[in-house]
Interface confidence: low
C-alpha cells in the first residue's frame, strides 16, 4: 500500500523434519481480533488460504495442510505436525477486524544427514598420474538443507589445489524433499600417502545449532615403483635344526615385483634358484644344517622388466650332530670301574650332561662319566645329553646300557598274598641279572615272560587256588649262567565279608584283589621302560 511503512522481517521458527511447528500469530489486540484470523502459506509469492479462525474455532481449508493443522493456545497458535522440507516457506496470519493486519512467520526446516558413507577407490592410484585421481567418494544421505562437506587427510582439512586436489560435490533431491550429497575427492598422491588416512566430515545445522558427522577413516591403495628389495627370515634370532624357517622377499614397491630366491652353491659359488611355495616364500621345514648358506632375492617388475637384487643374507641353521658314546655296550664285573665318554659336533659351543635314565638324576656335567666300584644297582641306562646353552631346545641325546655281571637278583624274597579258594590268581615275579635270567615256577599254570630291559625280566603266572596250593605256596626261580635265586609267595585265605579296606593289598610288587566274581588278580606294578636310543 503506497506510503505504508515497510513490512517487518518475518519471525523465524526452526524445526526438525517430522516434528511439530508452533506458528504463533503475533498480532496485537490493537492490530486484530485473534478470534477472527485467516492463515496463509506463501510459496513463490503466491498466497494460499490454509486455515480460518472464527470465534476462536479453527477450520482447515482443503489442500496439502488439511490433515496437519490444529489450533492451540486459545487460538493464538497454529500447530503444523509432521513437518517436511516442503514446509520451508512463509506462513502469515491475517486479522480481519478492526482492520486487516498481517503477521509473517518464516518456517525453517532441518534434518541431520545419515552417517557419511565413505568408499575408497578399490583400484588404487599410481603415484605418477598426470592429474588428480579419484581417491574416495563420500555420501551423506537424507539431510536438509544440503550439508557442507570437508575432506581430511591425516586429520588436516584438504583445500582445492590446482592440479593437486579437486573436490567434486553434487546433490540429488529425494522424493521426500531431503538431499543426498555426494562428494568425490580427487588428488595426486605420493608414495608417502600409502598410509595416509582420509575421511570426510558433514557439517549441518539443526535448531539446536551447528553439528557435524565424521566418516570412518580409510586408506587408499597407492601404486609406486620398487626401489629396493630385501630378504626377511622368520623366526628372527638363532635358528636350529628342526625349526620351521621362512625366507621371504620383500620390496618397497606396490604391487611387489615377481620374486625369486637363490642360494649360493658352496662348491661352484654360483647362485641357484630355490623352489618357493605358491606365495613366493621359501619354507625350510624342518630346517637342516645343509640349509645354511648365502641367500639373495631378485625382484622383477613385470611391467618394466627392471630387475633388482637384494643384499645377500647369511643363514646359519645351528645343529648338534648325532651323539656317540663309547664304549657303546659296556659290560662290567661287580667292583670294577667304567669310564663313559660322550662326543658330538655342533655349530656352537656344546655342553654335556650325564643322567641316570631311571631317575633323571644328573650325575656329571661334562663329556666324561666315571663309575667306580660298580655294584649291581649301577646296571641300567645312562643318558648323555649334548646341548647348546645359547639356543634353548637344541640338543641331542644318546642312551647307553651298562650291564653288571651277576647271578639273578629278585625284586622280593617273600610275599603274602590274600586269596579265596577257587579264584584264578595272577601272580608276578621279577628278577634281574647279567646275563638276563629266565624264570620258572614250581606249580602248573599259564606263565608268560616279558623282557623289561637288557638285564631285567618279568614273569606272570595264572593259577587256580586249590587246597594243595594254599598248603605249599608258590615259588618262582630265576637262573642265569652265574647262578639262581628264588622268591616265595605265601597264599592266605580271606573271607570276603571280613575284608578290611586295606587288607586286599600286600607290600612289594604283587597285589592280590578279590572281586564279587570268583577271581583274584595279583599284578605287577611296572616301571616305564627306557628306549634303547632316543634323540632330542
Amino acid at each position: 500500500v503506497p506510503g505504508e511503512a515497510e513490512q517487518p522481517a518475518p519471525e523465524l521458527v526452526e524445526v526438525e523434519v517430522g516434528s511439530t511447528a508452533l506458528l504463533k500469530c503475533g498480532l496485537s489486540q490493537s492490530q486484530g481480533n485473534l478470534s477472527h484470523v485467516d492463515w496463509f502459506s506463501v510459496h513463490k509469492e503466491k498466497r494460499t488460504l490454509i486455515f480460518r479462525v472464527r470465534q476462536g474455532q479453527g477450520q482447515s481449508e482443503p489442500g496439502e495442510y488439511e490433515q496437519r493443522l490444529s489450533l492451540q493456545d486459545r487460538g493464538a497458535t497454529l500447530a503444523l505436525t509432521q513437518v517436511t522440507p516442503q514446509d520451508e516457506r512463509i506462513f502469515l496470519c491475517q486479522g480481519k477486524r478492526p482492520r486487516s493486519q498481517e503477521y509473517r512467520i518464516q518456517l525453517r526446516v532441518y534434518k541431520a544427514p545419515e552417517e557419511p558413507n565413505i568408499q575408497v577407490n578399490p583400484l588404487g592410484i599410481p603415484v605418477n598420474s598426470k592429474e588428480p585421481e579419484e581417491v574416495a567418494t563420500c555420501v551423506g544421505r537424507n539431510g536438509y538443507p544440503i550439508p557442507q562437506v570437508i575432506w581430511y587427510k591425516n586429520g588436516r582439512p584438504l583445500k582445492e589445489e590446482k592440479n593437486r586436489v579437486h573436490i567434486q560435490s553434487s546433490q540429488t533431491v529425494e522424493s521426500s524433499g531431503l538431499y543426498t550429497l555426494q562428494s568425490i575427492l580427487k588428488a595426486q598422491l605420493v608414495k608417502e600417502d600409502k598410509d595416509a588416512q582420509f575421511y570426510c566430515e558433514l557439517n549441518y545445522r539443526l535448531p539446536s545449532g551447528n553439528h557435524m558427522k565424521e566418516s570412518r577413516e580409510v586408506t587408499v591403495p597407492v601404486f609406486y615403483p620398487t626401489e629396493k628389495v630385501w630378504l626377511e627370515v622368520e623366526p628372527v634370532g638363532m635358528l636350529k635344526e628342526g625349526d620351521r624357517v621362512e625366507i621371504r622377499c620383500l620390496a618397497d614397491g606396490n604391487p611387489p615385483p615377481h620374486f625369486s630366491i637363490s642360494k649360493q652353491n658352496p662348491s661352484t659359488r654360483e647362485a641357484e634358484e630355490e623352489t618357493t611355495n605358491d606365495n613366493g616364500v621359501l619354507v625350510l621345514e624342518p630346517a637342516r644344517k645343509e640349509h645354511s648358506g648365502r641367500y639373495e632375492c631378485q625382484g622383477l617388475d613385470l611391467d618394466t622388466m627392471i630387475s633388482l637384487l637384494s643384499e645377500p643374507q647369511e643363514l646359519l641353521v645351528n645343529y648338534v650332530s648325532d651323539v656317540r658314546v663309547s664304549p657303546a655296550a659296556p659290560e662290567r664285573q661287580e667292583g670294577s670301574s667304567l669310564t663313559l665318554t660322550c662326543e658330538a659336533e655342533s655349530s656352537q659351543d656344546l655342553e654335556f650332561q650325564w643322567l641316570r635314565e631311571e631317575t633323571g638324576q644328573v650325575l656329571e656335567r661334562g663329556p666324561v662319566l666315571q663309575l667306580h666300584d660298580l655294584k649291581r644297582e649301577a646296571g641300567g641306562g645312562y643318558r648323555c645329553v649334548a646341548s647348546v646353552p645359547s639356543i634353548p631346545g637344541l640338543n641331542r641325546t644318546q642312551l647307553v646300557n651298562v650291564a653288571i655281571f651277576g647271578p639273578p637278583w629278585m625284586a622280593f624274597k617273600e610275599r603274602k598274598v590274600w586269596v579265596k579258594e577257587n579264584m584264578v590268581l595272577n601272580l608276578s615275579c621279577e628278577a634281574s641279572g647279567h646275563p638276563r635270567p629266565t624264570i620258572s615256577w614250581n606249580v602248573n599254570g599259564t606263565a608268560s615272560e616279558q623282557d623289561q630291559d637288557p638285564q631285567r625280566v618279568l614273569s606272570t603266572l595264572n593259577v587256580l587256588v586249590t587246597p594243595e596250593l594254599l598248603e605249599t605256596g608258590v615259588e618262582c626261580t630265576a637262573s642265569n649262567d652265574l647262578g639262581k635265586n628264588t622268591s616265595i609267595l605265601f597264599l592266605e585265605l580271606v573271607n570276603l565279608t571280613t575284608l578290611t579296606p586295606d587288607s586286599n593289598t600286600t607290600t612289594g610288587l604283587s597285589t592280590s584283589t578279590a572281586s564279587p566274581h570268583t577271581r583274584a588278580n595279583s599284578t605287577s606294578t611296572e616301571r616305564k621302560l627306557p628306549e634303547p636310543e632316543s634323540r632330542g
Epitope: P255, T275, N277, D278, N279, V283
Partner: antibody
C-alpha cells in the same frame, strides 16, 4: 574355517565365454598369504590346473590354455573369477576353485560346465 | 612341464589289507609334492603335503614317503571309506601338474 563357494552357469554355448566366480569366506584374499587357483576335471578324467591369481592381481596361466584365460580378483567382495573364451565341447568339465599353498587344502564344491548348443 | 606318472592305474585290495601307490616325476621336485583322495561327486581332499606330512584330520593309516622323483602313498589297513581315486601333484614348478590317478577298488 576357510570355505570357497562357486557360482556361475552350468551351460555355455560353443564359441561363447565361460564365467565362474569363487567367493571366499573365513579368510581374506587380501591377506597375501595364498594364491587362488582354478582347476578343472574332464568327465571321468584327471585334474588339470588352469591358473592362479594373487590378491595384487598377478596371475599365471597354464600355457596350454593361456590365450583364452582371464582370471581376476575383487578383494572388496573377497572373490576371484575365471573367464574362458571361445569354448568348445572339449571344455566341458567340472571346474573347481582352490586355495594354493603347500598343495591345495581348501576347494570349492565344483561346477559342472557343459558346452553345448 | 613336469609330467607325473602314477602306477598302477587300478589297485584291487581287500579291506584290512595294505595298499601301496606310486608316483614318479619326470624331473626332481624335492619334497614339493602332495597326495589327494577323490570320491565320486566330491572335490579332491588333501591327504599328504611335503611328501610325508599328513594334512589336518587325516588318519594315521595314511603315510607318504619319497623325495626327488619317486614317491609312495601307503594305506596300512584299508577301510571301506578308503576306496576312491588317488591323485599325486607336484608344486615345485609352474604349471602345477597332477598324476592321472590310481583307482583303489574292493577286491
Amino acid at each position: 574355517q576357510v570355505q570357497l563357494e562357486q557360482s556361475g552357469p552350468g551351460l555355455v554355448k560353443p564359441s561363447e565365454t565361460l564365467s565362474l566366480t569363487c567367493t571366499v569366506s573365513g579368510g581374506s584374499i587380501s591377506s597375501g598369504t595364498y594364491h587362488w587357483s582354478w582347476i578343472r576335471q574332464h568327465p571321468g578324467r584327471g585334474l588339470e590346473w588352469i591358473g592362479y591369481i594373487y590378491y595384487s592381481g598377478s596371475t599365471y596361466h597354464n600355457p596350454s590354455l593361456k590365450s583364452r584365460i582371464t582370471i581376476s580378483v575383487d578383494t572388496s567382495k573377497n572373490q576371484f573369477s575365471l573367464k574362458l573364451s571361445s569354448v568348445t565341447a572339449a571344455d566341458t568339465a567340472v571346474y573347481y576353485c582352490a586355495r594354493g599353498g603347500d598343495g591345495y587344502r581348501y576347494w570349492g564344491q565344483g561346477t559342472l560346465v557343459t558346452v553345448s548348443s | 612341464e613336469i609330467v607325473m606318472t602314477q602306477s598302477p592305474a587300478t589297485l584291487s585290495v581287500s579291506p584290512g589289507e595294505r595298499a601301496t601307490l606310486s608316483c614318479r616325476a619326470s624331473q626332481s621336485i624335492s619334497n614339493n609334492f602332495a597326495w589327494y583322495q577323490q570320491k565320486p561327486g566330491q572335490a579332491p581332499r588333501l591327504l599328504i603335503f611335503g611328501a610325508s606330512t599328513r594334512a589336518t584330520g587325516i588318519p594315521a593309516r595314511f603315510s607318504g614317503s619319497g623325495s626327488g622323483t619317486e614317491f609312495t602313498l601307503t594305506i596300512s589297513s584299508l577301510q571301506s571309506e578308503d576306496f576312491a581315486v588317488y591323485y599325486c601333484q607336484q608344486y615345485n614348478n609352474w604349471p602345477r601338474t597332477f598324476g592321472q590317478g590310481t583307482k583303489v577298488e574292493i577286491k
